[in-house]
Interface confidence: medium
């Protein structure tokens, strides 16, 4: 059994957490798929209504703590976070974990957690980011293919299919050229525009109260832009926005390109069709 002091301390902490929490952690992306040897960037947006003096942050992978530094005076107490992990803080609200180079064992479920330690204890946790790492080494597949007894037949099959594809392609291209000449419409590189590029480093009416009597640079499917900071949307502006939260609007700050985390819903918007978010402290 713990000492009375410990028990009292715990009760004080529990009481403090029952106070209104204004700390929010939004993490992204939900899913990140990268090639081995490339770079993965995970972003955690930490917002609080009022100022804070000291913020404890934590990144975990599959439940294990990677790092647990704090931020004070605008600086991180630690710059590294797990193997090949680099941590950075960009005011006012972005904590970034960059894995470079990514290895196969970086695959896993990452969670960002934050706690304001000063002035008052408040904590919040992000959602999981699932990181999948694709092997990029052709030798990983070589042994498996070479050991296959019918390897020669596979090669022959692939070869003949390749020839057939070339012949078909030439015929198709000829027809396509004729059609384009007839119609005058050129789709240009329509086919190539759908090829995904995987970058190594993915560069986001009020009433009376008289007193007398709150850019999207799409790099690839792996990273989109993170508006910085998340815009505060006034309640009163009418915004036809399909998302359950208001459309981003320009706000001062420097963009950190990562994952888009849209701001909160504006009361002018229609409530979610399936009800409001779960009630409770974050």
């Amino acid at each position: 059994m713990g000492s009375p002091g410990m028990v009292l301390g715990l009760l004080v902490q529990i009481w403090a957490l029952q106070e209104a929490s204004s700390l929010s952690v939004q993490q992204g992306p939900n899913l990140l798929q990268v090639r081995q040897g490339s770079q993965a960037t995970l972003v955690c947006q930490v917002d609080q209504a009022t100022a804070w003096e000291r913020l404890r942050v934590k990144w975990t992978k599959d439940g294990a703590i990677l790092c647990q530094p704090y931020i004070t005076n605008g600086s991180l107490s630690l710059g590294v976070c797990g193997p090949q992990g680099r941590l950075s803080w960009q005011a006012p609200s972005h904590l970034t974990l960059q894995l470079d180079p990514v290895s196969l064992n970086h695959s896993g479920a990452y969670v960002c957690w934050a706690a304001v330690e000063i002035p008052e204890l408040e904590e919040a946790e992000g959602n999981i980011t699932r990181l999948f790492v694709d092997p990029d080494d052709p030798t990983q597949n070589r042994n498996r293919i070479a050991s296959f007894p019918g390897f020669l037949f596979v090669l022959l099959g692939v070869g003949s299919m390749g020839v057939a594809a070339i012949v078909w392609g030439a015929w198709f291209w000829g027809r396509r050229s004729c059609q384009q000449r007839d119609s005058g419409n050129s789709p240009g590189n329509a086919f190539y525009s759908n090829v995904l590029y995987r970058p190594r480093g993915a560069p986001k009416k009020s009433e009376d109260c008289s007193g007398e009597g709150k850019d999207q640079r799409g790099q690839s499917i792996y990273s989109t832009s993170f508006p910085q900071p998340a815009p505060r949307q006034p309640h009163l502006a009418s915004r036809p926005c399909p998302s359950p939260r208001p459309c981003p609007s320009p706000r001062p700050g420097h963009p950190v390109s990562m994952v888009r985390v849209s701001p909160r819903p504006s009361p002018t918007q229609q409530p979610r069709p399936k009800g409001f978010p779960k009630v409770g402290e974050e």
């Epitope: 931020i71 609200s93 006034p234």
Partner: antibody, heavy 120, light 113 residues
Framework: QVQLQESGPGLVKPAQTLSLTCTVS??????????WSWIRQFPGKRLEWMGY???????SYNPSLKSRVTISRDTSKNQFSLKLTSVTAADTATYCC????????????WGQGTMVTVSS | DIVMTQSPDSLAVSLGERATINCKSS????????????LAWYQQKPGQPPKLLIY???TRESGVPDRFSGSGSGTDFTLTISSLQAEDVAVYYC?????????FGQGTKLEIK
């Protein structure tokens, strides 16, 4: 659009409890990220923040009033309420409900306000 | 608690002229962690609730005319109306949003000279 409407007695006797309700329309008070405040404006125009309740039911109060003030909510009616005990003439003011959103501690939607006089 | 003091208490300015209202806080409202100053400005016209004009000391609220601007850092802040219009007659308040309790200045009454 969101609208806030205060209701309650306009006259309260000294030492009694002042009770006011703010009815919110056009928006759910349980929506994540929203904070529902009470602010009063004295006859001399001075503004005082009294406290707020958040979407999860957590509260924060002005320490100058903490022993006397309670803010609660009724999500089924989409209302939040103010209780101020042991009132004196100094509590005579226009009481307004307001909201702050998106984790920024300032107020962009206000109710019409209701004048409360403390007098025997 | 952070004490907010506005000056002057009242101000008379000619139409088209510049109006300047000052606000001083008893402690710094700047956070080096977020590079933000936690100060807001409101306008309250007779018979209306306060209306948010500026937050984070210098960010203009959506729909607020650009003749309104906020400046300052730390403990000293200014609200400037570059060219006074008749509809700007009101009481102006500053409010810090650095920590709880949130507190307001006593207000500055702006009139036309």
């Amino acid at each position: 659009q969101v609208q806030l409407q205060e209701s309650g007695p306009g006259l309260v006797k000294p030492a009694q409890t002042l009770s006011l309700t703010c009815t919110v329309s056009g928006f759910s008070i349980s929506t994540s990220g929203y904070y529902w405040s009470w602010i009063r404006q004295f006859p001399g125009k001075r503004l005082e923040w009294m406290g707020y309740i958040n979407y999860g039911g957590g509260t924060s109060y002005n320490p100058s009033l903490k022993s006397r003030v309670t803010i609660s909510r009724d999500t089924s009616k989409n209302q939040f309420s103010l209780k101020l005990t042991s009132v004196t003439a100094a509590d005579t003011a226009t009481y307004c409900c307001a909201t702050m959103a998106d984790r920024f501690a300032f107020f962009d939607v206000w109710g019409q306000g209701t004048m409360v006089t403390v007098s025997s | 608690d952070i004490v907010m003091t506005q000056s002057p208490d009242s101000l008379a300015v000619s139409l088209g002229e510049r109006a300047t209202i000052n606000c001083k806080s008893s402690q710094s409202l700047f956070s080096s962690n977020t590079n933000r100053n936690y100060l807001a400005w409101y306008q309250q016209k007779p018979g209306q609730p306060p209306k948010l004009l500026i937050y984070h000391a210098s960010t203009r609220e959506s729909g607020v005319p650009d003749r309104f601007s906020g400046s300052g850092s730390g403990t000293d802040f200014t609200l400037t109306i570059s060219s006074l219009q008749a509809e700007d007659v009101a009481v102006y308040y500053c409010q810090h949003h650095y920590e709880t309790p949130l507190t307001f200045g006593q207000g500055t009454k702006l009139e036309i000279k």
